[in-house]
């Protein structure tokens, strides 16, 4: 068992390898065809370590001439994955990440998949479909979400520290009850942020404090009983 003055509680969400997709089935394609084509760009938050499937505009493959996926990742040259129907050939340019692949053969399925999404997959993904009727685009601003690790501990009398470590985007920390708090943010080179909130409670009838961490990947609460003030022996409540 840890000492009360040391780290008392930690939490790290564990995600089974889930899949997320914005793709639609055939029925939806029929209903939403014009709407989807109008909605060219989509912001899409995806949890790290899940699988993601990105879709092209809902164009029947028989009408296709060329499909191109353009992938723009931070600090990388633009990667393109192209499929030409007439010659049944695929071509890749500047694509080095083996986790980003066609879902299956592009003549059967034009979707792109990212296996085990990482922070480095943050970026812009665009499918361009060339047809006799013109070019159709669909873009994704992929925002990779990282669940922060949450810790709560005491470092001195009636002062508690709550940390949300390496979250993306930054988590928000609140307390019950409210205390006299100072919050700092530390930005890491990989795009994650550590938020540290240090609070002091002068009011002596506060027994237990709760740190509530709000994040796009889910919320987490931890609580801790405050240590007594040194020298304080007896108190009637």
């Amino acid at each position: 068992q840890p000492n009360n003055s040391l780290m008392l509680q930690t939490s790290k969400e564990n995600h089974a390898l889930a899949s997320s997709s914005l793709c639609m089935d055939e029925k939806q394609i029929t209903q939403n065809y014009s709407k989807v084509l109008a909605e060219v760009n989509t912001s899409w938050p995806v949890k790290m370590a899940t699988n993601a499937v990105l879709c092209c505009p809902p164009i029947a493959l028989r009408n296709l001439i060329i499909i191109t996926w353009e992938i723009i990742l931070r600090g990388q040259p633009s990667c393109t994955k192209a499929y030409k129907k007439e010659t049944n050939e695929t071509k890749e340019t500047n694509c080095t990440d083996e986790r980003i692949t066609w879902v299956s053969r592009p003549d059967q399925n034009s979707d792109l998949q990212i296996r085990t999404v990482a922070i480095t997959h943050d970026g812009y993904y665009r499918c361009i479909m060339v047809t006799p009727d013109g070019n159709f685009h669909r873009g994704y601003h992929l925002q990779v979400l990282v669940t922060p690790e949450v810790t709560l501990f005491q470092n001195r009398n009636r002062t508690a520290v709550c940390k949300a470590v390496a979250g993306k985007p930054a988590a928000h920390i609140s307390w019950i009850p409210e205390g006299d708090c100072a919050t700092k943010q530390e930005y890491w080179s990989n795009g994650t942020v550590t938020v540290k909130s240090t609070c002091h409670w002068e009011v002596h009838n506060v027994s237990t404090v709760t740190c509530h961490v709000s994040h796009l990947t889910g919320n987490k609460s931890l609580y801790i009983e405050l240590l007594p003030v040194p020298g304080a022996k007896k108190s009637a409540k």
Epitope: Q1, P2, N3, N4, S5, I176, P177, N205, V206, S207, T208, V209, T210, S221, L222, Y223, I224, E225, L227, P228, V229, P230, A232, K233, K234, S235, K237
Partner: antibody, heavy 114, light 107 residues
């Protein structure tokens, strides 16, 4: 896993005192508040107070102020709750609890009867 | 002191039904709480800690929600063994205070 073992049932006369013990194991005894809660027959739960064994710091509910004394023996990891000037309405099961109320003893029945 | 108003005080429900119990803290003061189950002659058993965390070994039909001053305890599908009295406990402020209890009977 935290275990709290309480002393056995007591029968006392009005005006007497009773001392209930609670021996803790499975956690750092001096680092967690220990609380006492009582429950009269057919009634709800009532918090009496708490003690921090590491410093001896205590909080008593004002209802029991002057009649209750909580102490801790760090050498045996045991806390004590003594209630004096007993009256019939003090007949209750007395529980010790720790780890922010997540671990409870089995309770000690104190019967006050003439 | 923070008063915890728990309702209802009693209810009689059929097996398989959904049960909801609420606790509200007085003075509009935000608190944190636990939910306990107590059967006759036994110590209270912690079911939900910190308003919404299901304790290890507790069936998933039990759940807790809410924050601030209003909290809800739910049994999604009542089982015969759930007949008991249920209490909330606020542990943010001294003195700690319990709700008055909800006695749950099976029809």
């Amino acid at each position: 896993q935290v275990q709290l073992v309480q002393s056995g049932a007591e029968v006392k006369k009005p005006g007497a005192s009773v001392k209930v013990s609670c021996k803790a194991s499975g956690h750092t005894f001096t680092s967690y508040w220990m609380h006492w809660v009582r429950q009269a027959p057919g009634q709800g739960l009532e918090w009496m107070g708490n003690i921090y064994p590491g410093s001896g710091s205590i909080n008593y509910d004002e209802k029991f102020q002057g009649r209750v004394t909580m102490t801790a023996d760090t050498s045996t990891s045991t806390v004590y709750m003594e209630l004096s000037s007993l009256r019939s309405e003090d007949t209750a099961v007395y529980y010790c609890l720790t780890m922010t109320g997540t671990s409870w003893g089995r309770g000690t029945l104190v019967t006050v009867s003439s | 002191d923070i008063q915890m108003t728990q309702s209802p005080s009693s209810l009689s429900v059929s097996v398989g039904d959904r049960v909801t119990i609420t606790c509200q803290a007085s003075q509009g003061t935000p608190i944190n709480l636990h939910w306990f189950q107590q059967k006759p002659g036994k110590a209270p058993k912690l079911l939900i800690s910190g308003a919404s965390n299901l304790e290890s070994g507790v069936p998933s039909r039990f759940s807790g929600s809410g924050s601030g001053t209003e909290f809800t305890f739910t049994i999604s599908s009542l089982q015969p063994e759930d007949a008991a009295t249920y209490y909330c406990l606020q542990f943010t402020y001294i003195p700690w205070t319990f709700g008055q209890g909800t006695k749950l009977e099976i029809k």
